[in-house]
Interface confidence: medium
């Protein structure tokens, strides 16, 4: 349906509050360096304009596209050239090239300091003084740090954030109430950001087909009672939603997401028995609830997969008539029967099935050729199962910090050219898979672990793409989305790496280390570990263990000393000399 004014249409559909929030998020994701006040002003102006267009659709400029309106507004920012350099050149382009240019300048690693919360009384005073501004600042700070954050979901988290403050600012001990709640929300937000970045990468690097296949597998697992046409319908709509959000079209994305939630709730009977509770909620909570809804029970009467995909005499005919649909039904049927498999594994199986049919349907006797295709899946299934088992055993033995260090060593040896901060960040996140997944029952472990690893490895790929330094990382990142994790797992030590020159400055520590929160202390130690490995890539696990043990003791000793700084400057060089000797 064509509207006279697109901006009025979205304003009317979304309502003023959500509209303003989404505009603020959009601007913050594009112009990540601008101060909050500038974005508030821009968002206010756009919202006022939209309001005017909603009242009079034939008003001046109301018929312009959203990209034109938003782009024109962004290009009025006076400091564009100073703050963003060549991004200012985008403003000389016409739509749609201008928007593509803005998108290309989104920075996945803007390097802002981590958000540090002021003390609770000050926070509560700010919240109570101007709730709207307070929540706007939250949207802005998250959006500029995560330029691909799923905007409608960010509105939901802002609502949760508001709920936390509404509750905790009334509490006797505000800090005790806020601390754990804000931390739990922070964890969810970081995971949400990484998941959406993975979806955007799937769409941008591997296209709609890859994203749709991923979604068919995921939704078939979650809604095994729905038929293939129903799954396809939801996947088609979901693909549109994520394409819009990943492309910066946040108003359309949020509007279409609400429409999809409405559709799912109106058609619960043909989708899942688990949607009822979600469907009674307001729009933001409803969409979030549907996205997280538990798996429906499997229908009891599922026939064997072999009947349709191996034993049927028409397999090659059905495949050749419409390859994508036939493979789609295979993926759907396999996924709904295997909720315990990771999506990545299911996609690998579908790929293997496709390769077998391509090969067999060209032979004189296809049925004999593909007769054992389902048995040939075994090694593909065993590989992630064994990987999860081995790594969970290691995690249980070492704990999260020790497991992170083991991964840090593993990944630094695989790709020593990658920057130290990236190796530390990615290995720390990879290590969290243990905490997140290893305590789950056997039937949920693989799905949890491998799909989480895919999301974390995507972060490595995104950061590496910005400054490519390792051909093998580029290869693993770009060859196949579903084989990224096996590709990284399969990398051995990079024998071509020339060790880094020793730099004493890298191993010089100061008393400020003692006052850092535990997580930041760990990062400092892990940074030293990576630098050590880059200097001595042939170091054995035993040697590293000894050196890291000595390092821990040194930090503990100096932090307990009366003259901390003196201790660091005196003992530090001794430690470095001992470490160098130990690693010869």
């Amino acid at each position: 349906e064509a509207y006279k004014s697109e901006i009025a249409h979205r304003y009317n559909d979304l309502g003023e509050e959500h509209f303003r929030g989404l505009v603020l998020v959009a601007f913050s994701q594009y112009l990540q360096q601008c101060p909050f006040e500038d974005h508030v002003k821009l968002a206010k102006e756009v919202t006022e304009f939209a309001k005017a267009c909603a009242a009079e659709e034939s008003g001046a400029n109301c018929d312009k596209s959203l990209h034109t309106l938003f782009g024109d507004k962004l290009c009025t920012v006076a400091s564009l050239r100073d703050k963003y350099g060549d991004m200012a050149d985008c403003c000389e382009k016409q739509e749609p090239d201008r928007n593509e240019c803005f998108l290309a300048h989104k920075d996945d690693n803007p390097g802002f300091p981590p958000l540090v919360a002021p003390e609770p009384d000050a926070l509560c005073a700010a919240f109570q003084d101007n709730e709207q501004l307070f929540l706007g600042k939250y949207l802005y700070e998250i959006a500029r740090r995560h330029p691909y954050f799923y905007a409608p979901e960010l509105l939901y988290y802002a609502q949760q954030y508001k709920g936390v403050f509404a509750e905790c600012c009334q509490a006797a001990d505000k800090a005790a109430c806020l601390g754990p709640k804000i931390e739990a929300l922070r964890e969810k937000v970081l995971l949400s950001s990484a998941k959406e970045r993975f979806k955007c990468a799937s769409l941008q690097k591997f296209g709609d087909r890859a994203f749709k296949a991923w979604s068919v597998a995921r939704l078939s697992q979650r809604f095994p009672k729905a038929d293939f046409a129903e799954i396809s319908k939801v996947v088609t709509d979901l693909t549109k939603v994520h394409k819009e959000c990943c492309h910066g079209d946040l108003l359309e994305c949020a509007d279409d997401r609400a429409d999809l939630a409405k559709y799912m709730c109106e058609n619960q009977d043909s989708i899942s028995t688990k949607l009822k509770e979600c469907c009674d909620k307001p729009v933001l909570e409803k969409s979030q609830c549907l996205a997280e809804v538990e798996r429906d029970e499997l229908p009891g009467d599922l026939p064997s997969l072999a009947a349709d995909f191996v034993e049927d005499k028409e397999v090659c005919k059905n495949y050749q008539e419409a390859k994508d649909v036939f493979l789609g039904t295979f993926l759907y049927e396999y996924a709904r029967r295997h909720p315990e498999y990771s999506v990545s594994l299911l996609l690998r199986l579908a790929k293997e099935y496709e390769a077998t049919l391509e090969k067999c349907c060209a032979t004189d006797d296809p049925p004999t050729c593909y007769a054992k295709v389902l048995d040939e899946f075994k090694p593909l299934v065993d590989e992630p199962q064994n990987l999860v088992k081995t790594n969970c055993e290691l995690f249980e033995k070492l704990g999260e910090y020790g497991f992170q260090n083991a991964l840090l060593v593993r990944y630094t040896k695989k790709a020593p050219q990658v920057s130290t901060p990236t190796l530390v960040e990615v290995s720390r996140k990879l290590g969290k898979v243990g905490t997140k997944c290893c305590k789950k029952p056997e039937s949920e472990r693989m799905s949890c672990a491998e799909d989480f690893l895919s999301v974390v490895l995507n972060r490595l790929c995104v950061l590496h793409e910005k400054t490519p330094v390792s051909e093998r990382v580029t290869k693993c990142c770009s060859e196949s989305l579903v084989n990224r994790r096996p590709c990284f797992s399969g990398l051995e030590v990079d024998e071509t790496y020339v060790p880094k020159e020793f730099n004493a400055e890298t191993f010089t520590f100061h008393a400020d280390l003692c006052t850092l929160p535990e997580a930041e202390k760990q990062v400092k130690k892990q940074t030293a570990l990576v630098e050590l490995l880059k200097h001595k890539p042939k170091a054995t696990d035993e040697q590293l263990k000894t050196v890291m043990g000595d390092f821990g003791a040194f930090v503990e000793k100096c932090c307990a000393a009366e003259n901390k700084e003196g201790c660091f400057s005196e003992e530090g060089p001794k430690l470095v000399a001992a470490a160098q000797a130990a690693l010869v």
Partner: nanobody, 119 residues
Framework: EVQLLESGGGLVQPGGSLRLSCAAS????????MLWVRQAPGKGLEWVSV????????YYADSVKGRFTISRDNSKNTLYLQMNSLRAEDTAVYYC????????????WGQGTLVTVSS
Amino acid sequence: EVQLLESGGGLVQPGGSLRLSCAASGFTFDTSSMLWVRQAPGKGLEWVSVIHQSGTPTYYADSVKGRFTISRDNSKNTLYLQMNSLRAEDTAVYYCAKFPSSRMKFDYWGQGTLVTVSS
């Protein structure tokens, strides 16, 4: 009882067009995905196109992609197939069918309508 009644077939020259219709009754049409299948003389059944209950998405066999368009009018309980740029190999009996609960097969189909493409 499920009933599907196809119409609109006939003789047409190569490059010509036809529009097939299928009137449905005996089940809730607006909650059922539907498809067109065809059977050429002496050949097996071949599926042509699928449409979701809401009208999107739609799927087509590779052999008809870009030439055929499936659509539906839920208020009239009717399924359509617009066939353009017809070729001799499109000659077949066309059946409309109700999409099943699971596999890419079909539960019920009508008596069919014959489409002959010949000069």
